[in-house]
């Protein structure tokens, strides 16, 4: 029997043991989060699988993920949403300490997919473990990119109160219009629900004492947000190590001075 021809993509293939990983993460999440205990993880996996299995992996739509989004519906309390751009590790370290604030990856759907890759093949029920479309070299409407665009949009749409965003001050473009934050989340914050966006610009180098809130790209972000009738605030986090330490131990005397 000749092996069936398989499309070769430029990106790495589906993460090994993808179905088992998603299912295990779902079970773990619903055990730890009482408000999600009603979720049936087999149904979640079936909806996830249904979004990309048997479909051409360069023609995935946000519509494909709607059944999954519906099953994973979750609300974040007002003032507790933390967005991030190009500084995922620190954002996650922060919400691990500040347990009442949430990044997308602290929500069920983000938690399920974080750091995973997946894709299927047209007209077969197989998962492609060999290769998946690369956003740049193959197509942008691939299963992974469309998933994150879909859940990021929903996460931003449901945010309320003061929304925070952590930005990487070590980059030459601190705010990038092409990032998920710049191209999706910023434009889906709802002015009738969101009073303000507060940016935390995280300094990378210990010798860097500049006011990065004056950076031209931050001014660009301020302009976009203000035009949407949302107030904008910005804070430099000069000492992210101290910042995290003070979140853990707010009573520490050194936390009374600036960070």
């Amino acid at each position: 029997v000749l092996p069936r021809w398989r499309q070769q993509w430029s990106g790495s293939g589906t993460t090994s043991r993808f179905p088992e990983t998603v299912l295990a993460r779902c079970v773990k999440y619903t055990e730890v989060h009482p408000e999600m205990r009603h979720v049936d993880c087999q149904s979640v996996w079936d909806a996830f699988k249904g979004a990309f299995i048997s479909k051409y992996p360069c023609n995935i739509t946000e519509e494909d993920y709607q059944p999954l989004v519906k099953l994973g519906t979750q609300t974040v309390p007002c003032n507790k949403t933390l967005l991030w751009s190009r500084i995922k590790d620190l954002a996650h370290q922060f919400t691990q300490v500040q347990r009442d604030m949430f990044t997308l990856e602290d929500m069920l759907l983000g938690y399920l997919a974080d750091d995973l890759t997946w894709c299927g093949e047209f007209n077969t029920f197989e998962i492609n473990y060999q290769s998946c479309p690369d956003w740049r070299k193959d197509c942008s409407n691939n299963p992974v990119s469309v998933f994150w665009k879909t859940v990021s949009r929903r996460f931003a749409e449901t945010a309320c109160g003061v929304v925070h965003v952590m930005l990487n001050g070590s980059r030459s473009k601190i705010f990038d219009k092409n990032s998920t934050f710049g191209s999706v989340e910023v434009h889906n914050l709802q002015p009738e629900k969101v009073q303000a966006l507060e940016a935390w610009v995280i300094h990378g180098g210990r010798e860097d004492s500049r006011d990065l809130c004056q950076d031209p790209t931050i001014k660009e972000l301020e302009s976009i947000i203000s035009k949407r009738n949302i107030r904008f605030f910005c804070k430099n986090i000069y000492r992210p190590d101290k910042f995290l330490q003070c979140v853990k131990n707010p009573e520490d005397s050194s936390c009374l001075s600036g960070i």
């Epitope: 190009r86 500084i87 590790d89 620190l90 370290q93 690369d134 956003w135 740049r136 990487n168 070590s170 980059r171 030459s172 473009k173 990038d176 092409n178 990032s179 995280i202 300094h203 990378g204 180098g205 210990r206 010798e207 860097d208 000492r239 992210p240 190590d241």
Partner: antibody, heavy 123, light 110 residues
Framework: EVQLLESGGGLVQPGGSLRLSCAAS????????MSWVRQAPGKGLEWVSV????????SNADSVKGRFTISRDNSKNTLYLQMNSLRAEDTAVYYC????????????????WGQGTTVTVSS | QSVLTQPPSASGTPGQRVTISCSGS????????VYWYQQLPGTAPRLLIY???QRPSGVPDRFSGSKSGTSASLAISGLQSEDEADYYC???????????FGGGTKLTVL
């Protein structure tokens, strides 16, 4: 003076393992991200792996994911690269390199490099 | 095939000015800093330019870096025979979550 001294290279068969070490001196090791970069014979530079200053986060090139593990022992001022399931295409000079600025959380570019250690994968 | 594209070779005569280009995309050069390295034959790479256009101490001001959009350039003025080496650009890529090096440019001083 900042110094980086790699060791642990050698000849190994395909499928074998090797552990590279990089002894650092002349700077506060625990304040800097560290990287491994390799150069195959007659080829260009290829980044392999990076580890943050405190060792909390790492990132690897796709070509070595699942096979190579970067780690560090800040008490010994030493960086490591554990290389498993070695392939012929892993044959290269492996350089250890120090991150540029003292960083809190992120990876940054390499400013000082060691002289390299040679890894040959051949049967 | 490298994601950062450099010409494989460049040349010039002593005293001349040469420019080496490095082309990337909006997930690397456009959003992050570019670094340039010089590798003399048989030696380890040496940092030449950091954060697009900054020179580390000890690097002659004959070397300069610039960036515009998704491309960067290294210029060497007053070319000297000791500049004969391989030159590499490097930057971080967000999509790949990795450092990238250009394929390298071999500079020959004629």
């Amino acid at each position: 003076e900042v110094q980086l001294l790699e060791s642990g290279g050698g000849l190994v068969q395909p499928g074998g393992s090797l552990r590279l070490s990089c002894a650092a001196s002349g700077f506060t090791f625990e304040d800097y991200a560290m990287s491994w970069v390799r150069q195959a014979p007659g080829k260009g530079l290829e980044w392999v792996s990076v580890i943050s200053s405190k060792g909390g986060s790492t990132s690897n090139a796709d070509s070595v994911k699942g096979r190579f593990t970067i780690s560090r022992d800040n008490s010994k001022n030493t960086l490591y690269l554990q290389m498993n399931s070695l392939r012929a295409e892993d044959t290269a000079v492996y350089y250890c390199a120090k991150g540029m600025e003292r960083q809190y959380y992120s990876y940054n570019a390499m400013d000082v490099w060691g002289q390299g250690t040679t890894v040959t994968v051949s049967s | 095939q490298s994601v950062l594209t450099q010409p494989p070779s460049a040349s010039g005569t002593p005293g001349q000015r040469v420019t080496i280009s490095c082309s990337g995309s909006n997930s690397n050069i456009d959003v992050d800093y570019v670094y340039w390295y010089q590798q003399l034959p048989g030696t380890a790479p040496r940092l030449l330019i950091y954060k697009d256009d900054q020179r580390p101490s000890g690097v002659p001001d004959r070397f300069s870096g610039s960036k515009s959009g998704t491309s960067a350039s290294l210029a060497i003025s007053g070319l000297q025979s000791e500049d004969e080496a391989d030159y590499y650009c490097a930057t971080w890529d967000d999509n790949l979550n990795s450092w990238l090096f250009g394929g390298g440019t071999k500079l020959t001083v004629l």
